[in-house]
């Protein structure tokens, strides 16, 4: 329904606090390099303007779209050209092209300094001195580093961040209270960002239908007692919410997400028995809780799928006349019966079913042609099952760090052109699938593992898209969203790769490695491992293990030495020489 003033409408719906927070997130996600103070100034100007529109919706410019208002504001930034280069050209465009232009310039890997956590006392003082600025800075720093972070969910993170400081800055042992909470928020935040990035990639690269198919499958698993019409309504609304957030329409997105949570809670009885606790919570917690809610129990005595989707004489007629509805029903019925399957597997099965019908329906005897379609599903189901079984066995045998290393070697050999930091980041995250999913019983392993791998491989895809270096990565990333993981799994060693020239500097280490955290030290070692494989792609596991063991011993030895720097210099030369000999470099 049309409002005279969109900005007044959203301000009233969301309230001043959420309005300001969301505008800050939006601006920080677009102009990722701008200083905090500049963004705060812009947000305050927009907020004051919104208030004038609330007072009088007919006031000048109040009828303008949010994209026009926000875009005009962003384009007032004086340093736009020198800071962002060609992004400044967006300002010469009219809406909606201008917003599309800003979206295209969002940077998944912005050149920003790593966030260093200050001492707890310093943070608590800053929190007490100016709580509002402290929390705004949190929103700003996360949003600019994660330009697709799900904005209403970031408000939830900020609320938890505030709660952590409120509680812990009064505690006897502030650090013991606060640091685990901040670690948890950081890890959950990274995971949330990556999950949302996949949703946006799905919408932007593969279209609304791809996202809707994903949503039908996931919501049908989660709400197996809900009718298809109910699931379809939720999918339509959820698609609108994510389309808005991924498109930078954060006020509309947050508003519509709140409406969706309200609807779900008002209609719990026809959706899921698991929503009761979620629906008793305040808005931000409620929305988060609904998004994470466990799968409801499957209805008893669900009939066989074959009746409607193989045996019925109307299969082809129903398919041809409304593919979206018929295939949507197939996906819904299959997914609600299979919480043990990953969403991507369910989508592969639906695609196979669709392809079979498209091939068979025009035939002389369609039923004979598609009668065995369910048999075609067996290898598709077994492939991820076997892969997960093998990799969980490997994980249990090696532990997380060495499992990550095995994946580092595997993926560097598959796509050696990819930058070392990207290979390290992606392989480390792929390796986390072990501790995340292998502890689960078989019925939960596949949805945990394969859907998590989809999220991680999407990180590889978005990072690679910024600076494409490998045709194989481009192919796996762009051909099919649901077949990305099987595509990468199927890649063998890249025989066309010309090994990297040996550079001793890459393997020169200094005493600063000794003061790093265990995680940072692992990353240093894993960076060296990737470089080794890039120099010697045909190196065997045994050769690489020997070199890495020597390297670990070298670091341990020199970190215990009195003159660490000298040790690193002298022993490092020996290590490089020994490694070159061992690998035949």
């Amino acid at each position: 329904d049309a409002h005279k003033s969109e900005v007044a409408h959203r301000f009233k719906d969301l309230g001043e606090e959420n309005f300001k927070a969301l505008v800050l997130i939006a601006f920080a996600q677009y102009l990722q390099q701008c200083p905090f103070e500049d963004h705060v100034k812009l947000v305050n100007e927009v907020t004051e303007f919104a208030k004038t529109c609330v007072a009088d919706e007919s006031a000048e410019n109040c009828d303008k779209s949010l994209h026009t208002l926000f875009g005009d504001k962003l384009c007032t930034v004086a340093t736009l050209r020198e800071t962002y280069g060609e992004m400044a050209d967006c300002c010469a465009k009219q809406e909606p092209e201008r917003n599309e232009c800003f979206l295209q310039h969002k940077d998944d890997n912005p050149n920003l300094p790593r966030l260093v956590r200050p001492e707890v006392d310093v943070m608590c003082t800053a929190f007490h001195d100016n709580e509002e600025t402290f929390l705004k800075k949190y929103l700003y720093e996360i949003a600019r580093r994660h330009p697709y972070f799900y904005a209403p969910e970031l408000l939830f993170f900020a609320k938890r961040y505030k709660a952590a400081f409120t509680e812990c800055c009064q505690a006897a042992d502030k650090a013991a209270c606060l640091l685990p909470k901040l670690d948890e928020l950081r890890d959950e935040g990274k995971a949330s960002s990556a999950k949302q990035r996949l949703k946006c990639a799905s919408l932007q690269k593969f279209g609304e239908r791809a996202f809707k198919a994903w949503a039908v499958a996931r919501l049908s698993q989660r709400f197996p007692k809900a009718e298809f019409a109910e699931v379809s309504k939720l999918v339509t609304d959820l698609t609108k919410v994510h389309t808005e957030c991924c498109h930078g329409d954060l006020l509309e997105c947050a508003d519509d997400r709140a409406d969706l949570a309200k609807y779900i809670c008002e209609n719990q009885d026809s959706i899921s028995s698991k929503l009761k606790e979620c629906c008793e919570k305040p808005l931000l917690e409620k929305s988060h809780c609904i998004a994470e809610v466990e799968n409801d129990e499957m209805p008893a005595d669900l009939p066989s799928l074959a009746a409607d989707f193989v045996e019925s004489k109307d299969v082809c007629k129903n398919y041809a006349e409304a593919k979206d509805v018929f295939l949507g029903m197939f996906l819904y019925e299959y997914a609600r019966r299979h919480p043990d399957y990953s969403v991507v597997l369910l989508l592969r099965l639906a695609k196979t079913y669709e392809t079979t019908l498209e091939k068979c329906c025009a035939a002389a005897d369609p039923h004979e042609c598609y009668a065995k379609v369910f048999d075609e599903f067996k290898p598709l189901v077994e492939e991820p099952q076997n892969l997960i079984k093998q990799n969980c066995e490997l994980f249990e045998q090696l532990g997380e760090y060495k499992f990550q290393n095995a994946l580092l070697v595997r993926y560097t050999k598959k796509v050696p052109q990819v930058s070392t930091p990207t290979l390290v980041e992606v392989s480390r995250n792929l390796g986390k699938v072990g501790s995340k999913c292998c502890k689960h019983p078989e019925a939960k392993r596949m949805p945990c593992a394969e859907d998590y791998l989809s999220v991680v491989l999407n990180q590889l895809c978005v990072l690679h898209e910024k600076t494409p270096v490998s045709d194989r990565v481009t192919k796996c990333c762009t051909e099919s969203l649901v077949n990305r993981r099987p595509c990468f799994s199927a890649l063998e060693v890249d025989e066309t790769y010309v090994p990297k020239e040996f550079n001793a500097e890459t393997f020169t280490f200094h005493a600063d490695i000794c003061t790093l955290s265990e995680k940072e030290r692992q990353i240093k070692k894993q960076t060296a491992l990737v470089e080794l494989v890039k120099h010697k792609p045909k190196a065997t596991k045994e050769q690489l293990k020997a070199v890495m063991d020597d390297f670990a011993a070298f670091v341990e030895k020199c970190c215990k030495a009195d003159d660490k720097e000298t040790c690193f210099a002298e022993e490092g030369k020996k290590l490089v020489a020994a490694s070159q000999a061992a690998l035949g470099l």
């Epitope: 593919k323 025009a362 035939a363 002389a364």
Partner: antibody, heavy 121, light 110 residues
């Protein structure tokens, strides 16, 4: 040689009826999905409808109720029965096969030469 | 209503030129169900490309198709004398009854 040959076109008054034929040689029509596509003089192509090998038919929304596609397997011939004709139905009518392996996709590989239908008073 | 919009409606080009024709669909086509046809005066259309980018056998490799969802392109990398014709895109949708063609792009000699 594989070919489709349309016939039955001509001049007809508004409100009248006409039956077009599409005779096949070199292929067995009963194994194919066959479409009718029309093209008004100097205008766009327009899909009319399809008959699958099984005999199931589908029509463009505007053609439902007025146009009927049928097939006589013994004559290896396809038909388009057109009733309640309007001046805007004036066009060249083509029969065309859907690429094997597809049922609902707009991939039409073998075409006849077309037959002209003129609806005029 | 389903719309398949081709642009430009006509263009003039010389032999050897690179020619690009676009086809925009509203809503998006089903599962890349997009085809391109070539039609010469007095003749039936000829299928060049299906599934947005797959070349029909016998069609020269100078023809290529790309795109997905709503935006598609037909490219002729180096126009030959026999390529002067009208080109149509065809789209398939959720319902077979919505099968539609664009209104054509006439490629003329400059």
């Amino acid at each position: 040689e594989v070919q489709l040959v349309e016939s039955g076109g001509g001049l007809v008054k508004p409100g009248g009826s006409l039956r077009l034929s599409c005779a096949a040689s070199g292929i067995d029509l009963s194994n194919y999905a066959i479409n009718w596509v029309r093209q008004a003089p100097g205008k766009c192509l327009e899909w009319v409808g399809i008959i699958w090998a099984s005999g199931t038919t589908f029509y463009a929304t505007w053609a439902k109720g007025r146009f009927t596609i049928s097939r006589d397997d013994s004559k290896n011939t396809l038909y388009l029965q057109m009733n309640s004709l309007k001046t805007e139905d004036t066009a060249v009518y083509y029969c065309t096969t859907t690429v094997p392996g597809y049922s609902t996709a707009p991939y039409f590989d073998l075409w006849g030469q077309g037959t002209l239908v003129t609806v005029s008073s | 209503a389903i719309q398949l919009t081709q642009s430009p409606s006509s263009l003039s080009a010389s032999v050897g030129d690179r020619v690009t024709i676009t086809c925009q669909s509203s809503p998006s086509v089903w599962s890349n169900f997009l085809s391109w046809y070539q039609q010469k005066p007095g003749k039936a259309p000829k299928l060049l490309i299906y599934e947005a980018s797959k070349l029909t056998s016998g069609v020269p490799s100078r023809f290529s198709g790309s795109g997905s969802g709503t935006d598609f392109t037909l490219t002729i990398s180096s126009l030959q004398p026999e390529d002067f014709a009208t080109y149509y895109c065809g789209g398939g949708y959720s319902s077979i009854s919505d099968t539609t063609f664009g209104c054509g792009t006439k490629v003329e000699i400059k």
